[in-house]
Structure formats: structure tokens, C-alpha cells
Interface confidence: low
């Protein structure tokens, strides 16, 4: 199921999904002066089987001034590796997108794509946070947020990250000192009875799926 709202906002921080769970949708948005072709998809959908996940549908933009010109769609796999996706994309990532079961990698850009991507996340999606340039992490903890299902309602866990205005910038897990991205986190149903004795944020994934609209700057 789709997540109802956006991941939490943290002052002076940005977030990014390193891989997208099956069921995630990405709006086919075109930049100013362009529009979706009439027969084109409204969104791309992450789908897959037990061994492979990929984005279904293709986004196509055409000039608003012309009716016949359709623009090139999804690049080939070779091009995907070379393309820089967002400003938050890091050289080292906490997970190998291609090998994470049930997840799609960052969709490659399409020609005349809008500068902003609008994702619709599903329950169990995790996003990672980092302080923007010129700020550093004052409080280190799980710099991540997970969309959980609790009592039939979706919510995002609160990342334990506070960014302070100093020169050193924090990085994504795996780049510098990991904020905290434990491996092998189980996807389990969230119990209504919370019995944890620690005040730390719980970031377990929910196994059920329910959407959030999230926008990310696209360079």
C-alpha cells in the first residue's frame, strides 16, 4: 500500500531513496514547454518477480508547440550507469540497488524531464538523510526514515539527525562514518503494543504495503 504523506523534513538536510520498493510510482512529469504525449504513461511503476525488479512504462515528453514530435524515452542500461541522477546521489551507496530483492534502482532520466521528481512511496520504503553542504550532523543516529503501517495507518519514522551550521558536511552511510544503516533489517509487521525500553527511533520496515508524494530535486 502507498504511504499517506511525505518523509519528515529536517532543517538543512535532504533525503534520498537508494532503491525503490516494488509498487513505487514515479510521475511522468515534463519540463516547462513540454508535455506528456497523449498516449503516454502517467507514471512509471516499479514491478518485478522474485529475481528481478524494473520500471514498467516509459515516460515520454513532447514539445507543447508541436504535436508530432515525440522525444526519446528511457536510456539503455549502459547509459544508466553513467547518468548522474540527483544531487543526493552518492558514489558509494549503502545498498547495491541492482541486487536488492524487490527493489528498483533509480530510474534513468528521460528527455525533457521536469527538474523535480514526484515519487509515490510504498510501505517499507526507506530513505536516507544527509546534511546539506556547510552543515554537519550534530546528533548521530539512524539518519534514515521508514514508511511503516501502524494500526492501519501509514507513517514515517523520524530520523535522528540534526544538522548544525559548521563546515564539515555529513555523508550518506558508507561514504564517511555511517549514520546507521544496519544490514539485514527484517521486514516485520509493526505491533500495536510498543515494548521497547530505548528512546531511540525504531526503523523497522513494515511488511504490508500502503503512498506518499515526495519531490526530489533532479539535476
Amino acid at each position: 500500500e502507498l504511504c499517506d504523506d511525505d518523509p519528515p523534513e529536517i532543517p538543512h538536510a535532504t533525503f534520498k531513496a537508494m532503491a525503490y520498493k516494488e509498487g513505487t510510482m514515479l510521475n511522468c512529469e515534463c519540463k516547462r514547454g513540454f508535455r506528456r504525449i497523449k498516449s503516454g504513461s502517467l507514471y512509471m511503476l516499479c514491478t518485478g518477480n522474485s529475481s528481478h525488479s524494473s520500471w514498467d512504462n516509459q515516460c515520454q515528453c513532447t514539445s507543447s508547440a508541436t504535436r508530432n514530435t515525440t522525444k526519446q524515452v528511457t536510456p539503455q542500461p549502459e547509459e544508466q550507469k553513467e547518468r548522474k541522477t540527483t544531487e543526493m546521489q552518492s558514489p558509494m551507496q549503502p545498498v547495491d540497488q541492482a541486487s536488492l530483492p524487490g527493489h528498483c534502482r533509480e530510474p534513468p532520466p528521460w528527455e525533457n524531464e521536469a527538474t523535480e521528481r514526484i515519487y509515490h512511496f510504498v510501505v517499507g520504503q526507506m530513505v536516507y538523510y544527509q546534511c546539506v553542504q556547510g552543515y554537519r550532523a550534530l546528533h548521530r543516529g539512524p539518519a534514515e526514515s521508514v514508511c511503516k503501517m501502524t494500526h492501519g495507518k501509514t507513517r514515517w519514522t523520524q530520523p535522528q539527525l540534526i544538522c548544525t551550521g559548521e563546515m564539515e558536511t555529513s555523508q550518506f552511510p558508507g561514504e564517511e562514518k555511517p549514520q546507521a544503516s544496519p544490514e539485514g533489517r527484517p521486514e516485520s509487521e509493526t505491533s500495536c503494543l510498543v515494548t521497547t525500553t530505548d528512546f531511540q527511533i525504531q526503523t523497522e520496515m513494515a511488511a504490508t504495503m500502503e503512498t506518499s508524494i515526495f519531490t526530489t530535486e533532479y539535476q
Partner: nanobody
Amino acid sequence: QVQLVESGGGLVQAGGSLRLSCAASGGTFRTRNMGWFRRAPGKEREFVAAVSWNVDNKLYADSVKGRFTISRDNGRNMVYLQMNSLKPEDTAVYYCAADNIPLSSDMRPTATEYDYWGQGTQVTVSS
């Protein structure tokens, strides 16, 4: 062990004021959204007010808007509820609660969405 301890309750006449305090200990307070709930005799626990961890968002129940003010001091691990123009219908046990839900202006938090609770403090407003 996470602990939330409320204080500041008491008996006050209608139209009077009280300031409730909630002290948090045992963990990371400043990344938690905090809320106040209350339970009047024979009634369900109801949402009163909430404040996000970075104090960017504050939510109030319609019944207390303009009269109650929620605030927090992250340095002291404290949350406060300033209650003015109290009415007899404000009589209840007031509970402090902590959770990690990112608040939004269109949400009214419910008790099930809060993970940690204090024992409560009694507020009695006489007419």
C-alpha cells in the same frame, strides 16, 4: 527505560491558568515529537496539543485553540502546556506522550500513534 513525568496539575477556578510540565529522561528527547492528551472522567482519552521535535509544527485540538499553548525546551528535555482561560470541561487527567510521527497541519494525532506515556497529572477546574 524511557520515562515521562508530568507535573503542574492542581485545582484552579474557572478562568484561571495552569502550566503543566513534562520531563523526559532515558533517551533521545530532541528528535521526538511530543504531545499532550487528556482523559476526563468517563470519557475517552483525547488529543490536546502536539509539537514537532524541531518546534516547526504545533497542533491543537479545536476545543483548546487560543487558550492553550504547547512549547518545549530541547536543552532541558522539557515540554510545557500553558493553559489559560480554563473551563470546567477542561477537568481531566493530562498525559504527556512522545513519539516519532512527523506532524502535519492536517493531522490530529491519536493516542495509538504515541509510543511513550507519562502517568498523568490531575487538573480540576471548579466553577
